[in-house]
Interface confidence: medium
């Protein structure tokens, strides 16, 4: 039998053997095309693509359209994996999403979506999202339905402001809505009454900037 | 829980300006987008406009846009609506209302509305 | 900008139970969150629903709210009708331009 040699999410590899949490090297759907992203081999039996994560406040997330269609920052600490990869890749098959939420008082959280997928660029990335479980909130705090990806060069959203360039960060903002992942990074003791924060309010309220986060994906046939 | 506490009744004559306050308590007034809705007697709700105090930007319909002023004072948590040329028809009772949501475009937490009446 | 369009009045004897309209003009009703008010005399006007279908505490049960892409339309329903839910009632939606309201629909309970 011939080895995969090419892999287009961390699932694959996790099942070619490879099941240690790292940097692994996967390609575009159809493509030669090749991106580094990070896999949580670990989480939930592993296999998870992780597409965003937020940690220390290292990486500006204040960045334009093409940076964040392109991805941005280093797999191995913040970093942001490329909308233009993860509608693709979202495009081929059903996904399922899970956001980890940390606070700065110790406590964390998850919100789960059952089939997740990012429209195209000529939809603006629009994010499709169904079925919320987890511990993160009983209202996904994602707009329903899903927004268009905003940033501080492409405004797209349903608000007679710039929710990006008000806000920091691209993010799939309604008007403006109530989450930005890719919000202002704000160190502890600093974390609260921040409208421009990392903002998940369905679990942590109004003005509360996280500690840390992370959005994976995983094909929900895993 | 938020309060919104609106300034008293006006009587104006027309052609003339009236400036109506909101002071906010209970919340993070500077992040939050106060609005004004207007209903006039025998008529329904009117959005004119909104202001997110800690931008200090505001927001106008396109109805009013020219002859209402919002703007906020974050010392006093207080945001005022100005409408100027004042006429007969925009007698109505004027209410500020924000959302437990930052900037979100709905009304959770209204105030007890001021009464402005335009009457030569 | 669009439309809201709601009925003028509705009525409905108590027990009942009454759906009120709320059909948007143009671009699809799902692309924006709906919210429902209800406005007594004298009074300001309070939210019974917003995102669609979401209740906040304190709104009793018997108030629901729905959206149907097909008639592109919301509806507030309110069943086991009574006598204190006589009011106005203003759908409101938003888009890029700001914040728009419906009519409002003159709810009578009868008897």
């Known amino acids: 039998k011939e080895e995969q040699t090419t892999f287009r999410d961390c699932a694959e590899i996790f099942k070619s053997g490879l099941t240690t949490s790292g940097i692994y090297t996967l390609t575009f759907p159809n493509s030669t095309e090749e991106i580094k992203a990070y896999c949580d081999m670990d989480v939930g039996g592993g296999g998870w693509t992780v597409i965003q994560h937020r940690e220390d406040g290292s990486v500006d997330f204040q960045r334009t359209w093409k940076e964040y269609k392109e991805g941005f920052g280093s797999p191995l600490g913040e970093y942001w994996l490329g909308n233009e990869f993860v509608s693709q890749l979202t495009g081929q098959h059903r996904y399922v999403l899970k956001i980890q939420l940390k606070d700065w008082e110790g406590n964390e959280a998850h919100s789960l979506y059952d089939h997740f997928y990012l429209a195209g660029e000529e939809s603006n990335y629009r994010i499709h999202l169904t079925g919320l479980t987890g511990t993160a909130g009983k209202i996904s705090s994602i707009s329903q339905p899903g927004s268009d990806f905003s940033t501080k060069d492409s405004d797209n959203d349903k608000c007679i402001c710039k929710c990006s360039q008000m806000l920091s960060g691209g993010w799939w903002f309604d008007a403006c809505g109530p989450s930005n992942l890719n919000g202002q990074y704000y160190p502890q003791k600093q974390n609260t009454n921040k409208f421009n924060g990392i903002k998940w309010y369905y679990w942590k309220g109004s003005g509360y900037s996280l500690k840390a986060t992370t959005m994976m994906i995983r094909p929900a046939d895993f | 829980q938020v309060q919104l506490v609106q300034s008293g009744a006006e009587v104006k004559k027309p052609g003339s300006s009236v400036k109506v306050s909101c002071k906010a308590s209970g919340g993070t007034f500077s992040s939050h987008a106060i609005s004004w809705v207007r209903q006039a007697p025998g008529q329904g709700l009117e959005w004119m406009g909104r202001i997110i105090p800690i931008l200090g930007i505001a927001n106008y319909a396109q109805k009013f846009q020219g002859r209402v002023t919002i703007t906020a004072d974050e010392s006093t948590s207080t945001a005022y609506m100005e409408l100027s040329s004042l006429r007969s028809e925009d007698t109505a009772v004027y209410y500020c209302?924000?959302?437990?949501?930052?900037?979100?475009?709905?009304?959770?937490?209204w105030g007890q509305g001021t009464l402005v009446t335009v009457s030569s | 900008n669009f439309m809201l369009t709601q009925p003028h009045s509705v009525s409905e004897s108590p027990g009942k139970t009454v759906i009120i309209p709320c059909t948007r003009s143009s671009g699809s009703i799902a692309s924006n969150y709906v919210q429902w008010y209800q406005k007594r005399p004298g009074s300001a006007p309070s939210i019974v629903i917003y995102e669609d279908k979401q209740r906040p505490s304190g709104v009793p049960d018997r108030f629901s709210g729905s959206i149907d892409s097909s008639s592109n339309s919301a509806s507030l329903t309110i069943s086991g009708l009574k006598t204190e839910d006589e009011a106005d009632y203003y759908c409101q939606s938003y888009n890029s331009r700001g914040v728009m309201f419906g009519g409002g629909t003159k709810l009578t309970v009868l008897g």
């Open positions: 209302a924000t959302s437990r949501l930052e900037w979100l475009l709905y009304l959770d937490y």
